[in-house]
Amino acid sequence: EPPTACREKQYLINSQCCSLCQPGQKLVSDCTEFTETECLPCSESEFLDTWNRETRCHQHKYCDPNLGLRVQQKGTSETDTICTCEEGLHCMSESCESCVPHRSCLPGFGVKQIATGVSDTICEPCPVGFFSNVSSAFEKCRPWTSCETKDLVVQQAGTNKTDVVCGPQDRQRALVVIPICLGILFVILLLVLVFIKKVAKKPNDKAPHPKQEPQEINFLDDLPGSNPAAPVQETLHGCQPVTQEDGKESRISVQERQ
């Protein structure tokens, strides 16, 4: 009885089970009752990658430089040529017949996976705590600056597109400014005291001094802000006095309206 099915690596033709041609070879003639299947090797620029009964080998793929392609792996009689894209480009499809430039991740997005010759850039939105302020095919989302590690505080919150803005802490500023101001005041006070002492010791020209009761001198009266009825003079951080603006009444602890 003629066979209805053949073994692996065989095919049925004219009631005969014939051997398939091995990879890298094409079919020249089917087997007969008296002869084996005849196969011939594929030529230099051709291939067949399976056990087959093909009468023609397939042409190797051409990696067209005009389409941005280059050879990644040269074809053999058993394998096709593998093309890939030039730097900065990736394949448009799985078959890689042409190439397109890698896309850039816009601000607010970072590179999750850098593009290869066969895959495009994969972008991801920058999560909270990260930002990207550039359009790039390489840069990942960067973490916000940590103000704490620099002994600073956040003055402006970060976004997915901007970093945080750091500034000095209020307490820290006070710790620096107050001792400086106190130091300056102390020096001024000393100078005033020395000056007053000198003035007090100066003898009157020829005029005899009438006997007077010792008078308590209140040095504080001469100091700014010692008169509760007088307006308080504003000062800048640098301890410089601010002159009262013309046309404005002096008011204590009254906030100006914006």
Epitope: S19, V28, D30, T32, F34, T35
Partner: antibody, heavy 112, light 112 residues
Framework: EVQLQESGPGLVKPSQSLSLTCSVT?????????WNWIRQFPGNKLEWMGY???????NYNPSLKNRISITRDTSKNQFFLKLNSVTTEDTATYYC?????WGQGTSVTVSS | DIVLTQSPLSLPVSLGDQASISCRSS???????????LNWFLQKPGQSPQLLIY???NRFSGVLDRFSGTGSGTDFTLTISRVEAEDLGVYFC?????????FGSGTKLEIK
Amino acid sequence: EVQLQESGPGLVKPSQSLSLTCSVTGYSITTNYYWNWIRQFPGNKLEWMGYIKYDGSNNYNPSLKNRISITRDTSKNQFFLKLNSVTTEDTATYYCARLDYWGQGTSVTVSS
Amino acid sequence: DIVLTQSPLSLPVSLGDQASISCRSSQSLENSNGNTFLNWFLQKPGQSPQLLIYKVSNRFSGVLDRFSGTGSGTDFTLTISRVEAEDLGVYFCLQVTHVPFTFGSGTKLEIK
């Protein structure tokens, strides 16, 4: 159905050449198979002489040395046997065959 | 060359009997692909040989299942299960594994 038919002279003089034609119908000799010449001597002994393949290449029985030539005419779907320098020992019935199909044979006598 | 030795040279049988013919090769007929190109032919009186069995055991189209072939390597057998009058003639084995192709000397099947 595949059919083969031999033709040629029935009588050849010694030292001359024997030329036979095989006409094939029902199958192209360029498609596949080996197209053989076989002879049968008196007393039934069979001898394979040689073949021409579908692609035109040949293979001959070394016993026939350089006396044998098998050619073909693909336009007429025919193949040919030429045997040079015949002797009386070449007297036989000559068959052309694809092996699964045979011609009816032609008797050739070598005699002066 | 491969020598094929057939036995017996003559086989007298009664109609309806089983007949077995042996063909021994001087070397293995199995090729590198594992195929064995050993064939059996019947030549009826006044006719050209006709193919019965190819590749040891495969019946050619139209051949009755009374005919079967077995064997491997160098030993092969053709068996006719129930001989009929139309089976009479000379049986040949032929190997086409190696060039030159060679025939057995033939076995004549005749009525007792």
